[in-house]
Interface confidence: low
């Protein structure tokens, strides 16, 4: 029988009546076009819905949009289009929602061809009121909020000007011309690239990287010969053209661009690319594309300075620049990432790491699944996860893998069980331990979401036919109940729940189609009465994360410490609640070789924890360029993994000596960098 449909599943009592009383329908007075939905603030219940409809006329396209607002998590909506003077809103800019709980919203309007500038509508009270503001420029990009101060906005114009507002879009000032890309850094700093000779495209590889720390009063050139730049964690990266040829190298700064070091990564040619897959304040995952149109590259993990890199994973699937990669941070368990590799026979396989890229392994075969036709050995195979690449290939995969930081250990994903990803219709699998073990959760493709910090999982079957049934589970996907939320089926377009998985409300979006017209409709279901009581201490159990061998003294140690969590028992049907905080108790582990990466010039042979010298560097002095000085590295081959908190135990020696020699890295050295003021 399908998972959750056997006799041992305890049923939730009287759930049909409870859900029926908490199901709210809203039919939108709209012709079907496109719909976009944004949550405004955290735990406010405020949702903005923008519907747009294009009527193609003979000479031009006439557009119409409507704006709706809910303040009860989508149970009721009010048409507030009049607050924006019935103006047509440009959907490509989306709704720019302010950071944290600022309550700020910016909508960018469509304006007629001859106008001097664009127009925005601004709200700072969670979309209760809007102020119309005419801009002195035509925006090219969505308004970007400073993460530190939501009154500070930046935008690029269609003329490549960099515009800044210090009063939430009321007044704008052009602080620089000829700008290609601009990003907020920390402390209200803006980084941007500029061109000198004509255009961003023409000057690619000859751009300058600039910084302003005072919103455009003064500037500092912090890099030349720039191809592109990126920010990740506390690292600033720039890819820089080499002097002699068309290759480029990554340079990294941890002081906002004042000083730079060349990253110990391979250089790339014109057709290749670098990509920051993930970054935090400790380290970076960097993808380096292989030469040629291979569709794969290598993942490297950095040290705590972002300079020395260790090879983490070969043949990492990443199709083209800005293309598809399956790299996924499993946010429900520290240190876990999932991605895909392209094997020699061009099949795609899923790999998982539990220690932040130190080791990668195949996903364990689910207990309740058989190996499919891709498996050579029917008794030995792995689970392979469908993610962005499968979605881009139009496989029958409606959703990418899902995990939430406050639903500890839970990962939900579409997958197939065999030697590689299959093009057959996938099933849905769940892990409750952060990816170590998996179970088939639902037959066939589904949309899914997590509510109440994992207390409820909701799913809807992916079907081309209209639907009227939703499935839900209160025991982490073991058992499922079905609820018919409407008598008249709808063409389903999406599930929406408040980001953060704390809510107990789910909105089902779709449209109804009749002979004459089609209309948007939403059904919002509140599960609060299913989880009747608040969870108590007895509802939680202690769980040791990353536990693979309870008999081992070091069991659960990942990155130098282990964590015990209080987790909801699967049998408990109760509310974690909106204020639920993950309870965890860390304890430090003693250092072993597993807590160290191989240093510059060393590598780890397969299935060995010891680092050995790279043959080509044997007997050579290890010297590299750091902050424009030649450095000599004395090492026995190990360096602590960034973020690793182990203490005691194994303690390999590592020392970096300044050789007092200058070295250049095709980059502007700090003393040559110029500053200027406006």
């Amino acid at each position: 029988s399908a998972p959750g449909e056997d006799e041992e599943c305890g049923r939730v009592r009287d759930f049909v009546a409870k859900l029926a009383n908490n199901t709210h329908q809203h039919v939108f007075d709209d012709l079907r076009g496109s719909v976009s939905l944004s949550w405004v603030g955290d735990s406010t219940g405020v949702i903005l819905v923008l519907t747009t409809f294009h009527v193609p006329l003979v000479i031009m396209t006439f557009g119409q949009s409507k704006l709706y607002r809910s303040e009860d998590y989508g149970k009721n909506f009010k048409d507030i289009t009049d607050l924006i003077n019935n103006t047509f809103i440009r959907t490509e800019f989306g709704m720019a929602i302010g950071p944290e709980n600022s309550g700020k919203v910016v909508l960018t309007a469509e304006v007629s061809g001859g106008s001097r500038g664009g127009r925005i509508f601004r709200s700072s009270d969670f979309a209760k009121n809007f102020v119309q503001t005419d801009l002195p420029f035509h925006p090219l990009t969505q308004m970007m909020y400073s993460p530190q101060n939501s009154d500070y906005l930046l935008a690029l114009s269609t003329e490549n000007g960099l515009w800044v507002s210090k009063n939430f879009g009321g007044k704008w000032e052009e602080i620089h011309k000829a700008v290609c890309l601009a990003k907020w850094g920390s402390d209200n700093t803006i980084f941007f690239t500029t061109y000198a000779n004509g255009s961003c495209k023409a000057d690619l590889g000859a751009l300058e990287l600039w910084r302003t720390s005072d919103l455009g009063k003064s500037f500092k050139t912090i890099g030349v010969k720039i191809y592109s730049f990126g920010l990740g964690g506390r690292f600033l990266f720039a890819s820089v053209m080499a002097d002699k040829d068309t290759t480029r190298r990554i340079h990294v700064s941890t002081d906002q661009g004042d000083t730079w070091s060349m990253a110990q990564l391979p250089s790339v040619g014109q057709e290749q690319f670098y990509s920051i897959l993930a970054a935090n304040d400790d380290m970076v995952f960097m993808h380096v594309d292989e030469p040629g149109d291979t569709g794969f590259g290598t993942i490297f993990t950095s040290d705590d300075r972002g300079i020395v890199y260790s090879k983490s994973l070969d043949r990492h699937l990443y199709t083209t620049t800005g293309g598809e990669t399956d790299f996924t941070n499993v946010t429900s368990l520290r240190g876990v990432y999932i991605t895909s590799v392209l094997s020699e026979d061009n099949s795609i396989q899923t790999m998982i790491t539990f220690d932040q890229g130190g080791r990668w392994t195949h996903l364990r075969k689910p207990e309740n699944s058989e190996c499919d036709a891709t498996a050579k050995n029917k008794n030995e195979c792995s689970l392979h996860i469908h993610a962005s690449y499968s979605i881009s290939q139009k496989l029958n995969v409606p959703m990418a893998p899902l995990s939430e930081p406050n639903a500890v250990g839970i990962v939900i994903a579409h997958g197939s069980v065999g030697d590689a990803i299959s093009v057959m219709v996938p099933d849905v699998y769940i892990s409750d331990d952060g990816g170590y073990s998996w179970t088939k959760m639902l037959e066939g493709p589904h949309y899914y979401t997590i509510l109440d910090s994992g207390g409820i999982i909701v799913a809807i079957e992916h079907s081309s036919r209209p639907i009227n049934v939703i499935k839900f589970s209160t025991d982490e996907g073991q058992c499922w109940q079905t609820y018919t939320f409407t008598r008249d089926p709808i063409y389903f377009t999406g599930l929406a729940s408040e980001p953060g998985a704390r809510s107990m409300n789910i909105s089902i979006w779709g449209f109804t189609e009749s002979f004459l017209t089609s209309q948007w409709v939403s059904y919002t279901i509140d599960f609060k009465d299913i989880l009747e009581r608040n969870c108590e201490e007895k509802d939680y159990t202690i769980w040791l994360a990353h536990s693979t061998d309870p008999e081992d003294y070091e069991d659960g140690c990942i990155l130098g410490y282990k964590e015990q969590f209080l987790r909801l028992r699967k049998s408990s049907v109760c509310q974690n609640g909106r204020d639920y905080v993950v309870t965890k108790q860390p304890s430090i582990c003693l250092c072993s070789l597993e807590d160290f990466l191989c240093d510059f010039g060393y590598y780890r042979p397969e299935n060995d924890s010891k680092c050995v010298e790279q043959p080509e560097l044997k007997g050579h002095d290890l010297e590299f360029c750091l902050y424009g000085r030649e450095e000599h590295l004395t090492t026995n081959g190990y360096r602590k993994i960034p973020g690793d908190k182990c203490q005691g135990g194994v303690n390999p020696v590592r020392e970096v000596k300044d050789l007092k020699k200058k070295c250049t890295s095709n980059f502007l050295s700090p003393e040559k960098q110029n500053s200027k003021s406006n």
């Epitope: 309870p550 008999e551 081992d552 003294y553 070091e554 108790q585 860390p586 304890s587 430090i588 003693l590 072993s592 203490q647 005691g648 135990g649 194994v650």
Partner: antibody, heavy 117, light 108 residues
Framework: EVQLVESGGGLVQPGGSLRLSCAAS????????MSWVRQAPGKGLEWVAT????????YYPDILKGRFTISRDNAKNSLYGQMNSLRAEDTAVYYC??????????WGQGTLVTVSS | DIQMTQSPSSLSASVGDRVTITCRVS??????LAWYQQKPGKSPKLLVY???NLADGVPSRFSGSGSGTDYTLTISSLQPEDFATYYC??????????FGQGTKLEIK
């Protein structure tokens, strides 16, 4: 019933060596970390060494590194402590303790080591 | 190294008294702390682990509390067999897993 019985203590001259043993019974020895802790006459407790369940990892305070070696034989349910270059300040009762992680939950009765000329 | 400061170093009390012994740690140890009791000529006995959990067979008059850097062992009603020396020990980071210097509890 969990039992830990130390042996091997005695009188030894400064600079000499001694091997302590601890025989374990009443529990599955090979799934627990084990530790040595000592107590000088009239003084407090001092952690000396720890070994992981499989014997892969060993840990010592800096002051004892190089002079004390902890080892175990899981087949014999035994823990050992090899002490070299003994000094007068190593005089103490040496306890072996079961160490599952966040505490030392069972202790032996101790064996006295006296370093004196 | 993490420093442990146990106080008082000794104290006199009577049967039936409520007694509190504290252990202050030089940095946050996230409740990774144990308490032991040792009687003269005997080996130590575990009372409390993970700051608040009573070990098997320990009478309920003993309790542990605290978090961060400050931890307390409380005996709610002192019994004659409780007169002993008490030690705290942390398990957050190594080396060393330091013990407190001990608190000697004597009959008044």
């Amino acid at each position: 019933e969990v039992q830990l019985v130390e042996s091997g203590g005695g009188l030894v001259q400064p600079g000499g060596s001694l091997r302590l043993s601890c025989a374990a019974s009443g529990f599955t020895f090979n799934i627990y970390g084990m530790s040595w802790v000592r107590q000088a006459p009239g003084k407090g407790l001092e952690w000396v060494a720890t070994i992981s369940s499989g014997g892969i990892y060993t840990y010592y305070p800096d002051i004892l590194k190089g002079r004390f070696t902890i080892s175990r034989d899981n087949a014999k349910n035994s823990l050992y402590g090899q002490m070299n270059s003994l000094r007068a300040e190593d005089t103490a009762v040496y306890y072996c303790a079961r160490h599952p992680g966040g505490a030392m939950d069972y202790w032996g009765q101790g064996t006295l080591v006296t370093v004196s000329s | 190294d993490i420093q442990m400061t146990q106080s008082p170093s000794s104290l006199s009390a009577s049967v039936g008294d409520r007694v509190t012994i504290t252990c202050r740690v030089s940095e946050n140890i996230y409740s990774n702390l144990a308490w032991y009791q040792q009687k003269p000529g005997k080996s130590p006995k575990l009372l409390v682990y993970a700051a608040t959990n009573l070990a098997d067979g320990v009478p309920s008059r003993f309790s542990g509390s605290g978090s961060g850097t400050d931890y307390t062992l409380t005996i709610s009603s002192l019994q004659p067999e409780d007169f002993a020396t008490y030690y705290c020990q942390h398990f957050w980071g190594t080396p060393p897993w330091t013990f407190g210097q001990g608190t000697k509890l004597e009959i008044k």
